[in-house]
C-alpha cells in the first residue's frame, strides 16, 4: 500500500510505500479557532473514521478519514 505521509497546516502530499502491516491510509484534520490547523497523513494498521458536522469548524474540531487504496489520502475530503 502507498499513502501520503506528511504533516502540514493545510493539505500536503508526500507518497511513501507503507510497511506490510499497514492496511489503511489515514488523514487526521484538526482545526482549532485560536490554535491553528494540523493535517496529519499516515500509514496505519488500523483506522476508525470520525466525521464532524460542517458548522463545527469555528468552535474547534477534529476528523479522521480512512481509505485502503494507493495514494487515496491525497485529498483532504474523500
Amino acid at each position: 500500500l502507498r499513502c501520503h505521509v506528511c504533516t502540514s497546516s493545510s493539505n500536503c502530499k508526500h507518497s511513501v510505500v507503507c510497511p506490510a502491516s499497514s492496511r489503511f491510509c489515514k488523514t487526521t484534520n484538526t482545526v482549532e479557532p485560536l490554535r491553528g490547523n494540523l493535517v496529519k497523513k499516515d500509514c496505519a494498521e488500523s483506522c476508525t473514521p470520525s466525521y464532524t458536522l460542517q458548522g463545527q469548524v469555528s468552535s474547534g474540531t477534529s476528523s479522521t478519514q480512512c481509505c485502503q487504496e494507493d495514494l487515496c489520502n491525497e485529498k483532504l475530503h474523500n
Epitope: P33, L34, R35, G36, N37, L38, S58, S59
Partner: antibody, heavy 118, light 110 residues
C-alpha cells in the same frame, strides 16, 4: 512576500491608552488566527491575546484581561490591539504573529515598542 | 516567572552538539505539542520546530526536537557561530487557555 508590520507604539503615561495595528500582506489574512505576543526588557516572550479568523473566538492572558481588546478587519488585512489603563509592566516590544500550523506562530512582525512611563 | 522552565544559558564550541531542555506540566506539554523558536539579536522570533519534532520549512536539519512526558528538548548539532541566539519553547496550556512560553535560553558559541 509574506509580511506583518506593526505600528502604533510609543511613549505613554500610566493609565492612558494606546492602539496598536498590524498590517498583513502576502497571504490570505482571513484564513488564519492572529495573535499578539510581547517581550518586556530583559524578559522572555509572553502571549498577550489571540483572535480567530472570523473573530468568533478571542483569548487574553490574565495579565491584560479587562484592559486590552483585540480585533481584526479582514477587509483591510489588519489586526489591532486596543490597550487601556496601561501600566509600567506593559512596557515591552509587541509582536503580531500568524498562526498557521497548530500551536505554532509561523510568521512574526518586527515588533513595535510600547513604553509606559510618567 | 515563566510557565515553562528553560535553562537561562547554554554554550558549546563550534561543531559540537548542545541540548536545551524545556520542562512543563500535564496541562501544557503533557497534553499538547511543543514548538521551538529562535530569536537572533535584533530580529523577530523565527519558528524552528513544531508539533514536537517537525522541522519548519527552510530550517536547517541540524536542529531537532523531541518530547517525553512533560518535558521537551531542542538539540543543535554541528554548532555554528550564526546559531548564537535566544531559544524559546512554547506549548498550549489547557488551564490558562492560551499559549505559554519558556523564559528563553541564550546560546553562546565559544
Amino acid at each position: 512576500e509574506v509580511q506583518l508590520v506593526e505600528s502604533g507604539g510609543g511613549l505613554v503615561q500610566p493609565g492612558r491608552s494606546l492602539r496598536l495595528s498590524c498590517a498583513a500582506s502576502g497571504f490570505t489574512f482571513d484564513d488564519y488566527a492572529m495573535h499578539w505576543v510581547r517581550q518586556a526588557p530583559g524578559k522572555g516572550l509572553e502571549w498577550v491575546s489571540g483572535i480567530s479568523w472570523n473573530s468568533g473566538s478571542i483569548g487574553y492572558a490574565d495579565s491584560v484581561k479587562g484592559r486590552f481588546t483585540i480585533s481584526r478587519d479582514n477587509a483591510k488585512n489588519s489586526l489591532y490591539l486596543q490597550m487601556n489603563s496601561l501600566r509600567a509592566e506593559d512596557t515591552a516590544l509587541y509582536y503580531c504573529a500568524k498562526t498557521g500550523i497548530l500551536d505554532a506562530f509561523d510568521i512574526w512582525g518586527q515588533g513595535t515598542t510600547v513604553t509606559v512611563s510618567s | 516567572q515563566s510557565v515553562l522552565t528553560q535553562p537561562p544559558s547554554v554554550s558549546g564550541a563550534p561543531r559540537q552538539t548542545v541540548t536545551i531542555s524545556c520542562s512543563g506540566s500535564s496541562s501544557n506539554i503533557g497534553q499538547n505539542s511543543v514548538t521551538w523558536y529562535q530569536r537572533l539579536p535584533g530580529e523577530a522570533p523565527k519558528l524552528l520546530i513544531y508539533y514536537d519534532d517537525l522541522l519548519h520549512s527552510g530550517v536547517s536539519d541540524r536542529f531537532s526536537g523531541s518530547k517525553s512526558g512533560t518535558s521537551a528538548s531542542l538539540a543543535i548539532s554541528g554548532l555554528q557561530s550564526e546559531d548564537e541566539a535566544e531559544y524559546y519553547c512554547a506549548s498550549w496550556d489547557d488551564s490558562l487557555k492560551g499559549p505559554v512560553f519558556g523564559g528563553g535560553t541564550k546560546l553562546t558559541v565559544l
